[in-house]
């Protein structure tokens, strides 16, 4: 509900500054609050436009301030108006000269239909003139000069709504400037009644609250709150939830509070007088000090709050036993909440006694919409209301208000909600590579639409035309490999970005489709690669028996290790070998093979081989003679790769003997790099030569090596390493 309050400070204008302040408490008006002159109430008042400014001390408040030199232009009737969701509330008030000839008993007077009413003005200046009384600027009554009493009265024995209006009194020779004003508010219904036909019964509006004739709700005086105005506010506070505060040194002194009709204007609790600058006499409290304390157990009477009950007692007169009421307090509600658009379940938690019920807790959106709890629970000390907004959107950002209204009072806590747009990638992910059971994906998570920061990223994928749920993997890098996919299957892919906070999963981005490769046949078995000539290699394999009717062939890929030369050869599936020709002599080649149908098969392991050499082999290198004994010695060597070396020959003879007396040892395994010579003579010098042989011929040794055996019984010398042929 709208809580609009007009503070008139001061209604009696002298030479001091005077003002009107209009406050929209606890809600945000859709249109600006307006303050204007009320020509309905007083037609012939000053026409000057008002200088309305923002009240810097409050968020939603407007103010008009008149400096002392403007005093002559102030007299008249004013209004403040606020609107929210089509509903308008207008509050009226008046200002008059303190030096007027008459002064009203009260600024406003609220009566019920049918009441016996006396509107009274006190004579302040004595003049030899007739007194005149006007209603809404029109003459209604005069009193001859000799009969003007100290209290000038308009008597309405049976007040009707049409009697309502601004009544003014002055001497006939005066003018608006010397007039006194009072406003009569006549409730459309008789006492305790409300409704369009006035046949419903009001709840009790305590502490001089007034029952609204249209809704049956109580309008509570400044300083009291709750459904029946039973609860006193904290000292010097006012408003429907008591969250507005009087900033003066003496609290709300000199503040006349005007509320929507039928309330009218009054002082805050604890003050009385036309200027609200007189404190209540002992034993009295409330607005205009009209309420009398009748505290049951002799408790103290506070002029602001009434009876201050002893522990264990409650009620206006401390007449009821029970736990004293405690104004509700809203707890654990942060000032600022960041929310992701979508479903939102705000929580409002409150303490107090009695504990607030679910009917007493509401949430007000920035546009004024009132939400009621979807769920509710309470512990010994707290009530927790859970609200549900099925789809909160960025326009819902702004000040929300948690409101709690119990018999013990009302409290509101505004908090700011910032609604974030969920992130969504602008581009579909890209497929970099695929196989029959994997795909390499660039997720293309940026750029994205919506709000960051991005907390995590998900790659979603599923086969097309399958009624399967989307599978997902969490990804940290932009490049990701999807494994365990089905072969020859069309998949769709998209990326979902997640921002911080509950419900931070954005909508998946654009979809990319791709198809995995068909599963391949296994590679040929028994693969063997051998050199055939200087320019050919021969690749052989076992016969292939395919499991399906599909045509197949063998694909052979060969590439040179030394050069960037690659060739792929297709071989009919019924063959078991292929001659790789047009090769370069003395070159190493890497070969692999696979069996292809419509789908490509799996590659075999790499096989390597050298073509036969076109030159004599180089001499073995690093020849060492070691481990010499009286009858043996170990010879080791290394050979260079790539010369098709097929064997090594070791030739030795006793030094000085004829050439034809040598012994040749032929080692046909070219991978062996060590040999032990045995059966040598002790203390004998030998000449040792070593050759490498290939398809062209033998290497030419540049020099011979000498070996001298040891005498018998001496320990061997020099241990060698490497492969040894014994």
């Amino acid at each position: 509900a709208m809580d609009l309050i007009l503070i008139n400070s001061l209604p009696l204008v002298s030479d001091a500054e005077t003002s009107l302040t209009c406050i929209a408490s606890g809600w945000r008006p859709h249109e600006p609050i307006t303050i204007g002159r009320d020509f309905e109430a007083l037609m012939n008042q000053h026409q000057d436009p008002l200088e309305v400014t923002q009240d810097v001390t409050r968020e939603w408040a407007k103010k008009v301030v008149w400096k002392r030199e403007k005093a002559s232009k102030i007299n008249g009737a004013y209004f403040c108006e606020g609107r929210v969701r089509g509903e308008a509330i207008r509050i009226r008030t008046m200002k008059m000269r303190q030096q007027a000839s008459f002064l009203p008993a009260t600024l406003t007077m609220t009566v019920d239909k049918g009441d016996n009413v006396n509107i009274s003005f006190k004579k302040v200046l004595i003049k030899e003139e007739d007194a005149v009384i006007y209603k809404n600027g029109s003459f209604i009554h005069s009193v001859p000069r000799h009969e003007v009493p100290d209290i000038l009265e308009v008597h309405l024995p049976h007040a009707q709504p049409q009697d309502a209006g601004v009544y003014s009194a002055r001497y006939i020779g005066g003018n608006l400037f010397t007039s006194a004003f009072t406003r009569l508010i006549v409730r459309r219904c008789e006492a305790q009644k409300w409704g369009p036909e006035c046949n419903h019964l009001c709840t009790a509006c305590m502490n001089n609250g007034v029952c609204h004739e249209d809704t049956g709700e109580c309008i509570c005086p400044p300083g009291f709150m709750g459904r029946t105005c039973e609860k006193a506010c904290e000292l010097h506070t006012f408003g429907r939830t008591c969250k507005e505060r009087c900033s003066g040194q003496e609290g709300c002194k000199s503040y006349v509070f005007c509320l929507p009709d039928p309330y009218g204007c009054s002082c805050a609790t604890g003050w009385k007088g036309l200027q609200c600058n007189e404190a209540c006499h002992p034993g009295f409290y409330g607005p205009d000090c009209k309420l009398r304390c009748s505290c049951n157990n002799g408790e103290m009477c506070d002029r602001f709050q009434g009876c201050l009950c002893s522990p264990g007692w409650q009620g206006l007169q401390c007449e009821r036993e029970g736990i004293p009421r405690m104004t509700p307090k809203i707890v654990d509600l942060p000032d600022h909440i960041e929310v992701n658009s979508g479903k939102f379940n705000p929580i409002c938690k409150a303490s107090g006694w009695p504990l607030p019920t679910n009917e007493e807790m509401t949430l007000v959106k920035p546009d004024g919409t009132v939400l009621h709890p979807k769920d509710f629970n309470h512990t010994d000390h707290f009530s927790v209301a859970i609200f549900t907004i099925h789809r909160i959107l960025p326009p819902d950002s702004g000040v929300w208000v948690c409101s709690v209204n119990t018999v013990a009072g009302m409290v509101e806590k505004p908090f700011n909600i910032s609604v974030k747009v969920l992130p969504k990638p602008l581009n579909a992910p890209n497929v970099i590579d695929t196989g029959h059971n994997f795909a390499v994906i660039n997720i293309s998570s940026e750029p994205y639409f919506g709000d960051g920061p991005i907390k995590s990223k998900k790659l979603l994928y599923k086969p097309v035309n399958h009624y399967e749920a989307w599978q997902h993997i969490q990804v940290t890098n932009e490049i990701v490999t999807l494994n365990y996919l089905e072969p020859r299957t069309e998949y769709e892919l998209c990326v979902q970005l997640v921002r911080r906070g509950e419900g931070g999963e954005g909508h998946p981005g654009p979809v990319r489709r791709f198809t995995t490769a068909s599963i391949g046949l296994p590679p040929p078995r028994g693969l063997n690669l051998l050199p055939k000539s200087q320019t050919t290699l021969n690749l052989t394999w076992q016969p292939i028996f395919p499991s399906s009717e599909d045509d197949f062939y063998v694909e052979v890929e060969r590439r040179s290790v030394q050069k960037s030369d690659q060739q792929n050869i297709k071989v009919p599936g019924n063959l078991t070998s292929v001659l790789l020709n047009n090769l370069h002599p003395r070159e190493q080649y890497v070969v692999r093979a696979r069996v292809n149908t419509k789908a490509q098969g799996e590659w075999s392991e790499d096989l390597t081989a050298w073509t036969l050499s076109d030159i004599l082999p180089p001499q073995p290198e690093n020849i060492k003679i070691s481990n010499i004994t009286h009858s043996s010695a170990v010879i080791s060597w290394t050979i260079l790769d790539g010369y098709s070396i097929s064997s090594i020959t070791i030739r030795y003879k006793v030094q000085g003997k004829n050439e034809d007396q040598h012994v040749d040892v032929k080692i046909k395994n070219a991978t062996i790099t060590q040999y032990q010579l045995k059966g040598l003579e002790p203390e004998t010098a030998y000449q040792v030569d070593i050759f490498a042989e290939n398809n062209i011929g033998s290497s030419n040794p540049a020099f011979s090596h000498e070996l001298v055996t040891l005498p018998e019984s001496q320990a061997p010398a020099d241990l060698g390493g490497g492969k040894m042929l014994l």
């Epitope: 305790q192 409704g195 369009p196 036909e197 046949n199 419903h200 019964l201 009001c202 049956g216 018999v407």
Partner: antibody, heavy 117, light 113 residues
Framework: QVQLVQSGGGVVQPGRSLRLSCAAS????????MHWARQAPGKGLEWVAV????????YYADSVKGRFTISRDNSKNMLQLQMNRLRSEDTAVYYC??????????WGQGTVITVSS | DIQMTQSPDSLAVSLGERATINCKSS????????????LAWYQQKPGQPPNLLMY???TRESGVPDRFSGSGSGTDFTLTISSLQAEDVAVYYC?????????FGQGTRLEIK
């Protein structure tokens, strides 16, 4: 938590009297007007009577006027409905209720009155 | 007295579907001074007292799920349940409080199809 607990139902012969009670807790009873409504078996709801917060004003449905009396004891947080000269058409579940404006917000659990010879 | 007439008397709707209950008053319950409709809606489940759902024709009572909504003005009003749930099976009543005595509609029984 506001609660209205009803008592006093039963079977009664036509022409006889019965008194229904409604005990209120969790609210300042003396601040609220109170209502009685009823519901005949298998039928809809019918408003019966209302009493103002101070007991000064009372209104009745035409069907019960002159036979039923609504009253309250604010010191005991108690609402009563004295039903005299009962008729068979008064057979119903009777509810006490607190208003929210003109709607009835909190209802008692209901008490069954059967008027039968 | 203002007469309230509901239609239909009973209604069967599938779970998740929309349910609509109408209420007509014999005279307008719209008060022009404040543009408010003095109409309430209640839900009553077997063996329980009625439960206030709506007042001022369209203001949801605390704790009432937002699938319930009220609309209409003057003499013709509608209670809508946007997506029927199993727990919504009940009898629904409209009530005017424009004028005393307050009067109720005869009720609409809502069941699941």
């Amino acid at each position: 938590q506001v609660q209205l607990v009803q008592s006093g139902g039963g079977v009664v012969q036509p022409g006889r009297s019965l008194r229904l009670s409604c005990a209120a807790s969790g609210l300042t009873f003396s601040n609220y007007a109170m209502h009685w409504a009823r519901q005949a078996p298998g039928k809809g709801l019918e408003w019966v009577a209302v009493i103002s917060y101070d007991g000064e004003n009372k209104y009745y449905a035409d069907s019960v006027k002159g036979r039923f009396t609504i009253s309250r004891d604010n010191s005991k947080n108690m609402l009563q409905l004295q039903m005299n000269r009962l008729r068979s058409e008064d057979t119903a579940v009777y509810y006490c209720a607190t208003p929210k404006g003109g709607a009835l917000e909190i209802w008692g659990q209901g008490t069954v009155i059967t008027v039968s010879s | 007295d203002i007469q309230m007439t509901q239609s239909p008397d009973s209604l069967a709707v599938s779970l998740g579907e929309r349910a609509t209950i109408n209420c007509k008053s014999s005279q307008s319950v719209l008060y022009s001074s404040n543009n408010k409709n003095y109409l309430a809606w209640y839900q009553q489940k077997p063996g329980q007292p009625p439960n206030l759902l709506m007042y001022w024709a369209s203001t949801r009572e605390s704790g009432v799920p937002d699938r319930f909504s009220g609309s209409g003005s003057g003499t013709d009003f509608t209670l809508t349940i946007s997506s029927l749930q199993a727990e919504d099976v009940a009898v629904y009543y409209c009530q005017q409080y424009y004028s005393a005595p307050i009067t109720f509609g005869q009720g609409t029984r809502l069941e699941i199809k």
